[in-house]
Amino acid sequence: TIPPHVQKSVNNDMIVTDNNGAVKFPQLCKFCDVRFSTCDNQKSCMSNCSITSICEKPQEVCVAVWRKNDENITLETVCHDPKLPYHDFILEDAASPKCIMKEKKKPGETFFMCSCSSDECNDNIIFSEEYNTSNPDLLLVIFQ
């Protein structure tokens, strides 16, 4: 089973709430930073990241970044504060329970990013919004 990696310092002195006033606890997210990936032309992929982390701050959410260029494909999984840009983009879907990939314009590469706010939600990255997580034909991705 995956070890939950706890970040260096959690500051819970201030209670963090969401837009509905519900208390936010530190999220559990996949946190492998950047890894090579074989996830390509699929409706969804599993991260296959072996580190589940408790995010440093309660306001942080799970993020996944998929990038493809002429040389390789990478998948990045992290925790990040949605109030701050990531890779120069705002995390506009941070309240979503699912990680639904959206394409962003980056020169010289194909760049998709998603963010979400349920435990380990960046383990399953979804490229098609119609995708149903109960689909038995889920294609797994194996990291190199």
Partner: antibody, heavy 116, light 107 residues
């Protein structure tokens, strides 16, 4: 105000069944993994099992002593966690705590007594 | 399963004393160790996570150290409200096992 309130404990005979409930409030229950931890009278803490989020498939893990006898489920529409305990043994007698998995929040516990 | 062994199982101390509790894992768990305090009839309270990080709201007289297999909880100056039972817990692998507890009593 965050609350985890367990209920359903009581006296049951060996071989019997019991279902515990944990009503959650004050946070978005559906977003979090949840677990059960128990404590036999005068003894230490023992992790029972966990359930992951429904959206990721609701997978469960269990400690060896309860595997095959206990099941964990959740109803996100009711913000409620359940522990179904079957084929109960005297050694299952304990206070059962509902917890936000891997994070510092616990309910007050409910006592389960298995005795003839 | 990873076995967690605490020592001592109980100790007597006076207010103002420095108290040290140790916890040993049966295999390396890196820094994936939590310390809990429990008072009679109450749910456990998290004191230290990730071996050395102080949970918010916990007094600074509590500190944790160690990595790998050997860990320590230290109370620098014991206060009346600190008399309780203390548990270590590894969160490196499932199941996340606890130590058997250390009861801190008034001398």
């Amino acid at each position: 105000q965050v609350q985890l309130v367990e209920s359903g404990g009581g006296l049951v005979e060996p071989g019997g069944s019991l279902r515990l409930s944990c009503a959650a409030s004050g946070f978005t229950f559906s977003n979090y993994w949840m677990s059960w931890v128990r404590q036999a009278p005068g003894k230490g803490l023992e992790w029972v099992g966990r359930i992951k989020t429904t959206i990721s498939g609701g997978a469960t893990d269990f400690a060896a002593p309860v595997k095959g006898r206990f099941t964990i489920s959740r109803d996100d529409s009711k913000n409620t966690l359940y522990l179904q305990m079957n084929s109960l043994k005297t050694e299952d007698t304990a206070v059962y705590y509902c917890t936000l998995d891997l994070r510092a929040y616990w309910g007050q516990g409910t006592l389960v007594t298995v005795s003839s | 399963d990873i076995q967690m062994t605490q020592s001592p199982s109980s100790l007597s101390a006076s207010v103002g004393d420095r108290v040290t509790i140790t916890c040993r894992a049966s295999q390396s768990i890196s820094s994936y160790l939590n310390w809990y305090q429990q008072k009679p009839g109450k749910a456990p309270k998290l004191l230290i996570y990730a071996a050395s990080s102080l949970q918010s709201g916990v007094p600074s007289r509590f500190s944790g150290s160690g990595s790998g297999t050997d860990f320590t909880l230290t109370i620098s100056s014991l206060q009346p409200e600190d008399f309780a039972t203390y548990y270590c817990q590894q969160s490196y692998s499932t199941p996340p096992t606890f130590g058997q507890g250390t009861k801190v009593e008034i001398k």
